[in-house]
Structures are given as C-alpha cells and as structure tokens.
C-alpha cells in the first residue's frame, strides 16, 4: 500500500522584494497522525518557517481555508520578501508523538528573490 | 455514503480475551486515521486509541491490554482487549476521525456499537 | 491531559425554546473543540467542529462559538428531535482526545 508522500511541486520560485511568495506542498494520505511544519535549510541549523500549532508567524498565511475538511494542501504564503528570505524551503511531515518526530520531507523548493522593480 | 460496523462484543469472564472488528465502506479506509471510543452504561464517551498508519494511540487505562490494528486490505479495524476488567464494560464504538484545516482529529462517523460485557 | 467541564449537567425545556450548553476547556484549546448529540440508544452525531463550523446536513438552528478556553453550543429553536444528550471534545492536544461529561436535555 502507497505510503505518504510529500509533494513540492516547484523546484524553484523567484519573487520580487517586497512581494509574496506562495510555497506549494501537497500531501497523498492524512496518516500517519502527526502535523506539518515548514522550514528554511536542512539539518539541525534549519530555521522553523511556520508550525500552525505553536509560535507567532505574522508573515505566513496558510493557503489552504481554516475549515477546509480533510485537507491536503499544505501550501503557504510569506508577505514582503526581503533578499535575507532566499534559500530552500522544506515542507515536513512529522508523526505525532512525544515528542513528534521527522516522518518524511518534501524536495525542497529554492526561493530567489529578485530587484524591486523601480 | 460512508457505513461502519462493529461486531466481536459478548460477555467475557474477567482476565478474559476479546477481539472486536469493524467493517468500513463508503471512503478511502487506507488514507484515514480511524479510533475506538468506549461509553460505559449510563456514563459519558471515552477515547480508548487511534490508529493512523503503523501509528498508534492509546488511553492510559487501555494501554499494554488493548491493542489496536488495522487490515486495509479488509477495510477492517481491529481491537484485541486482553486482561479484561469489570471497568472495560462498555458499548465500543468505531469512528472515522477526520481534519479541517492543518488541524486534528475529531470523529465524523460512528458505528452503531457493539456491547462487551465483563462480568463472573 | 485537558479536562472539559460542561454545564449545565441537566437541562430541562419545551420545545420552541433557545438552548444554551457551556463547555469550559482546562487550557487553551484555540478552536479545536468539536460538539455531538446523541439519543438513546444511537451512536453521538457529529454536529460542530472547529468551534463554530457546522457539519454537512446540520440544521442551522445549532451553531457554536468560543475560542480558548470557552466555547458554547446554541440551538435557537429546540425542536422535539433535538432531546439528548450534547458532548464537547477537544482535539487540540491529544492523547488523550477529551470529552466533556455531557449536558443532558430533557423535555419540561
């Protein structure tokens, strides 16, 4: 039987300063049991993007609506990118637990960020 | 139209072994979490375990006695309750759970129950 | 573990009248509060989750609202078949899922 899979869809996005980028993340299966987490860079120095449950993200928006059922789309907004936003962003599936642990990551997608227009 | 059915419930002695199933139809069993929840008569719901893929969940009063599994093949879930108690008698229910947003997991659809009864 | 206290235990009404079941949660829960109904001798219905959003084919006299540590179920209009028994449960941090200990409506 298929097991869960993480799907970011685009390798690479390249946003204007001062835009938003839109991070894709889908995922096949609602189990295993455990949330999603959105981080910039791999390993242990890899910077926390956005966790729904704990923490104050005020740049990040979910894509997905709050009340949508059975929900797969994992996909995120972050407003008014700055140049220091560049780097790959990773979407991964954790599986419930104390603590949570890593169950599988997504391929990662490289933000650019490019010259505001003038 | 999703459709649970519990059956295995009877009487059992207690420190006896009891299995019961339940046959879902209706959704995509295999890509589900799917839980037990037990009602002792006259009281109120008790969460007794959740199993999502291999991952699995359980109420401390269950736990090293209740073991919860699932044969997707089957669209099956299993409960096996070993070294029952007076305590363990209840009505079993199976219930989807289902997500809304990034969060989870409430119960959508139950079964109709099946009674398990441990007494001497 | 989050302990969920419903109030009252017992509710006692005509039909007509609007219906207003409390459930106070021992920590923050945010949204993730779910409520059911159940009569006797069936299975609980899903009615509400996510505080406040109501599941397919529920009539739009039962709504919910409260976010933290205090949510509510009102039903505007009780009707005849509305008799039973209410659970909240919470979802926000488990295991263990909670339950509150139920408010039981009974015809005056």
């Known amino acids: 039987e298929e097991e869960l899979q993480v799907i970011q869809p685009d390798k690479s996005v390249s946003v204007a300063a001062g835009e938003s980028a839109i991070l894709h993340c889908t995922v096949t299966s609602l189990i295993p049991v455990g949330p999603i987490q959105w981080f910039r860079g791999a390993g242990p120095a890899r910077e926390l993007i956005y966790n729904q449950k704990e923490g104050h993200f005020p740049r990040v928006t979910t894509v997905s609506e709050s009340t949508k059922r059975e929900n797969m789309d994992f996909s995120i907004s972050i407003s008014n990118i700055t140049p220091a936003d560049a780097g790959t962003y990773y979407c991964v599936k954790f599986r419930k637990g104390s603590p949570d642990t890593e169950f599988k990551s997504g391929a990662g997608t490289e933000l650019s960020v490019r010259a505001k227009p003038s | 139209e999703v459709q649970l059915v519990e059956s295995g419930g009877g009487v059992v002695q207690p420190g006896g072994s009891l299995r019961l199933s339940c046959a879902a139809s209706?959704?995509?069993?295999?890509?589900?979490?799917v839980s037990w929840v037990r009602q002792a008569p006259g009281k109120g719901l008790e969460w007794v375990s959740t199993?999502?893929?291999?991952?699995?969940y359980y109420a401390d009063s269950v736990k090293g006695r209740f073991t919860i599994s699932r044969d997707n093949s089957k669209n099956t879930l299993y409960l096996q309750m070993n070294s029952l108690r007076a305590e363990d008698t209840a009505v079993y229910y199976c219930?989807?759970?289902?997500?809304?947003?990034?969060?989870?997991?409430?119960?959508?659809?139950w079964g109709q129950g099946t009674l398990v009864t441990v007494s001497s | 573990e989050i302990v969920l206290t419903q109030s009252p235990a017992t509710l006692s009404v005509s039909p007509g009248e609007r219906v207003t079941f409390s459930c106070r949660a021992s920590?923050?829960?945010?949204?993730?509060i779910a409520w059911y109904q159940q009569k006797p001798g069936q299975a609980p219905r899903l009615l509400i989750y996510?505080?406040?959003s109501r599941d397919t084919g529920i009539p739009d006299r039962f709504s919910g609202s409260g976010s933290g540590t205090d949510f509510t179920l009102t039903i505007s209009s009780l009707q005849s078949e509305d008799f039973g028994v209410y659970y909240c449960?919470?979802?926000?941090?488990?295991?263990?899922?909670?339950f509150g200990g139920g408010t039981k409506v009974e015809i005056k």
């Open positions: 996510a505080a406040s």
């Open positions: 449960q919470q979802y926000y941090d488990w295991p263990p899922f909670t």
């Open positions: 209706g959704f995509s069993f295999s890509i589900y979490a």
């Open positions: 920590q923050n829960v945010r949204s993730d």
């Open positions: 199993i999502g893929a291999d991952d699995t």
């Open positions: 219930a989807k759970d289902s997500t809304v947003g990034w969060s989870g997991d409430f119960f959508d659809y």
